[in-house]
């Protein structure tokens, strides 16, 4: 049940990431740590790296408010049901600084990819023999 809540939150975050991708030109063009091909059991650690990254609005045009609201939603901490499990893996997972830094567009694409991976793993884990390749 707790894990379901987490994954439902991940699904909602995908929509927020997609929204922010529409405003990529209004984000500060700063390079940010962007985990990719995250090893098994380090997904939560990588997720927290994405959340900690300093994604910022460039404060130009009419989109500043919607961008700031979306960034705030991205950074909202998930329920702490799995805090213990996440802490346990954090010691053996790469530090945020060790991940390749990417501009906002690629950062958001990689964030979305991680969210998709986590949801897909959750869905597959609830189904026997669902993964075909």
């Amino acid at each position: 049940q707790g894990q379901d809540r987490h994954m439902i939150r991940m699904r909602q975050l995908i929509d927020i990431v997609d929204q922010l991708k529409n405003y990529v030109n209004d984000l500060v063009p700063e390079f940010l740590p962007a985990p990719e091909d995250v090893e098994t059991n380090c997904e939560w650690s990588a997720f927290s790296c994405f959340q900690k990254a300093q994604l910022k609005s460039a404060n130009t045009g009419n989109n500043e408010r919607i961008i700031n609201v979306s960034i705030k939603k991205l950074k909202r901490k998930p329920p702490s049901t799995n805090a213990g499990r996440r802490q346990k893996h954090r010691l053996t997972c790469p530090s945020c600084d060790s991940y390749e830094k990417k501009p906002p567009k690629e950062f958001l694409e990689r964030f979305k990819s991680l969210l998709q991976k986590m949801i897909h793993q959750h869905l597959s884990s609830r189904t026997h023999g669902s993964e075909d390749s």
Epitope: I8, R11, I14, D18, Q116, H120, L123, S124, T127, E131
Partner: antibody, heavy 117, light 107 residues
Framework: QVQLQESGPGLVKPSETLSLTCTVS????????WGWIRQPPGKGLEWIGY???????NYNPSLKRRVTISVDTSRNQFSLKLSSVTAADTAVYYC???????????WGQGTLVTVSS | DIQMTQSPSSVSASVGDRVTITCRAS??????LAWYQHKPGKAPKLLIY???SLQSGVPSRFSGSGSGTDFTLTISSLQPEDFATYYC?????????FGGGTKVEIK
Amino acid sequence: QVQLQESGPGLVKPSETLSLTCTVSGGSISSDFWGWIRQPPGKGLEWIGYISSRGSTNYNPSLKRRVTISVDTSRNQFSLKLSSVTAADTAVYYCARSAGVTDFDFWGQGTLVTVSS
Amino acid sequence: DIQMTQSPSSVSASVGDRVTITCRASQGISSWLAWYQHKPGKAPKLLIYVASSLQSGVPSRFSGSGSGTDFTLTISSLQPEDFATYYCQQAASFPLTFGGGTKVEIK
């Protein structure tokens, strides 16, 4: 805005292989999940399966033996092959994108495939 | 497989009416439910995901609720463009499965 368009023969003979292609425009196929859903005449929707941009697949167990879904990122297309078809495979076939893995946010308009000799 | 049962199979309503469609899962699916609108010859359209989240660009007259096995799609004030068939779909486990559909017709 992502758009999807199904293409392929509208008539397939029994025992042959049904082949359909979905062309994606307005977005890249190199992220997200890409699926096929069908609707037999007068019936509900049936999920056939989907493929991730990286090539991992999930198929409906009821069709698994006969289905192959593949992706061609260079052409921004993905494909469905359904072997050994019978009249029961007559349906409107839809391709769709799943950004959220669990639901389909963009669909093609569908293409009717009739299985008949 | 998880079976999805929709009711009613059809409903006649007038513009401005409040319309409620229900979907029942054969086992608990938490909030892993989506709702679609489908018009003949058109591409189906995602309305709601994870039971109650409104898809971007969908009018706020559409709302979803429920968790576990029982779910509801509500159209608060039916508009002419809302006459269509509505489907629910579960995503708690593979295979993803759809309800049989509810046709919303003009009274």
